[in-house]
Amino acid sequence: GLNDIFEAQKIEWHEGSHHHHHHHHGSGSLVPRGSGSVPRWRQQWSGPGTTKRFPETVLARCVKYTEIHPEMRHVDCQSVWDAFKGAFISKHPCNITEEDYQPLMKLGTQTVPCNKILLWSRIKDLAHQFTQVQRDMFTLEDTLLGYLADDLTWCGEFNTSKINYQSCPDWRKDCSNNPVSVFWKTVSRRFAEAACDVVHVMLNGSRSKIFDKNSTFGSVEVHNLQPEKVQTLEAWVIHGGREDSRDLCQDPTIKELESIISKRNIQFSCKNIYRPDKFLQCVKNPEDSSCTSEI
């Protein structure tokens, strides 16, 4: 199995390090680790450490993805893992660049129908439930690279081949150019650049900022939609409350989004999804008689 493959390759990571829960000593402080007579000092960050079984999980996800997406079976998952590892291992986790991820981006190159892209902000689960039913539409996490990294955390250390399972830089408290943030910025930019025709975005109507300029959607994807390819951005504002009949398309932050998009010579439209549960049900069974009314 996959564990044997890693064992055979002697991939180096902090064995048992998940059990060493050091207290945080402030941003980027140094703490001793190891029980040898000579203390080994290592960086301590404010964010959670690398997800346990990170190498095995990435490799397993890659193999699974190629199994269920036959068009991607040309991908060599060992090379993908090597490229992923190469992007952050032995590098300072606050000094990661998009360039570091280029070998991985190249290996993970994938053609998705450019007019079937669904972006999302702060409402990932519903977006994924939707593309699970509407199989011809794709979120970033439906692509190989997004699928590999979804919900994972990772970082290394400068000048050692170790993976840091204790802590990784937090975007706010430590630094923004950390391995996870730079990865998502890179793949999100490429995903948005690939989009064409009508692009959909699912937004969370329950949040105080329905459109947040500081989200990945607001700071990366919006600005990388290509006006010469994208005709319209259509926002779907998802309502949280059962009795919420307000037109959230009139929300000031949605107006702000419309302004940004219009200035980029892309048309903007907005729809309220008042009943997300019914919305999904109607995507599954469009012939249902209750699906003709507004959702």
Epitope: G1, I5, A60, V63, K64, E67, P70, R73, Q78
Partner: antibody, heavy 123, light 112 residues
């Protein structure tokens, strides 16, 4: 050692539902896709669908989209198939199955199979 | 969907002789990665199917070297050299080039 242990035989009334299980052991459950296959009495094999236990995502053969629902419980490393609106056509043995990984590549063949669960639809 | 068509065997096959089972696919099963996604299974009476061959010609772990697979993009053969009593059962070919994976109708092997 990889093992897929399926639940015992089921008898279902026409129009009712049955849910059968496949408990995985000997490997990390979330690292592999689980497939389901149907074999009607004296007949060949038909692929029903797959589930990715890690994400809960699924895909189905067209003819099983309204018939079968695949789920997985990662805490018990168990995959399930629920068959709804039972008819005599659903009388069959149902297998769960999994591929092998050959040096970081999915072999494309079902190397591991459960022992099968016979579902009989009878009034 | 890709249609898999299996040929019949002249039954029963004398013990110790070779048997060849054929299978045809409605489309080429050769992937751009160079692999041909054709599998062979044996289902012994009362048992689950057992993977014999994957990628058209690669024997699965623990499978006797009496079993060999060959073919081109659409025409495939499973050869059993020196059939034995334990080889009795139904042999299925299966394509896994695309979804849904589809199986042949099966070829029954009986031994004289």
């Amino acid at each position: 050692e990889v093992q897929l242990q399926q639940s015992g035989p089921e008898v279902g009334r026409p129009g009712s539902s049955v849910k059968i299980s496949c408990k995985a052991s000997g490997y990390i459950f979330t690292d592999y896709i689980m497939h389901w296959v149907k074999q009607s009495p004296g007949q060949g094999l038909e692929w029903i669908g797959w589930i990715d236990p890690e994400y809960g995502s699924t895909d189905y053969a067209e003819k099983f989209k309204k018939k079968a629902t695949l789920t997985a419980d990662t805490s018990s490393s168990t995959a399930y198939i629920q068959l709804s609106s039972l008819t005599s056509e659903d009388t069959a043995t149902y297998f769960c199955a999994r591929v092998a990984i050959i040096t970081t590549v999915a072999s494309g063949g079902f190397a591991y199979w459960g022992q099968g669960t016979l579902v009989t639809v009878s009034s | 969907d890709i249609v898999m068509t299996q040929g019949a065997l002249p039954n029963p096959v004398p013990s110790g002789e070779s048997a060849s089972i054929t299978c045809q696919s409605s489309e080429s099963l050769l992937h751009s990665n160079g692999k041909t996604y054709l599998n062979w299974y044996l289902q012994r009476p009362g048992q689950s199917p057992q993977l014999l061959i994957y990628w058209m010609s690669t024997r699965a772990a623990g499978v006797s070297d009496r079993f060999s697979g060959s073919g081109s993009g659409t025409d495939f053969t499973l050869t059993i050299s020196g059939v034995e009593a334990e080889d009795v059962g139904v042999y299925y070919c299966q394509q896994f080039l695309e979804y849904p994976p589809t199986f042949g109708s099966g070829t029954k092997l009986e031994i004289k």
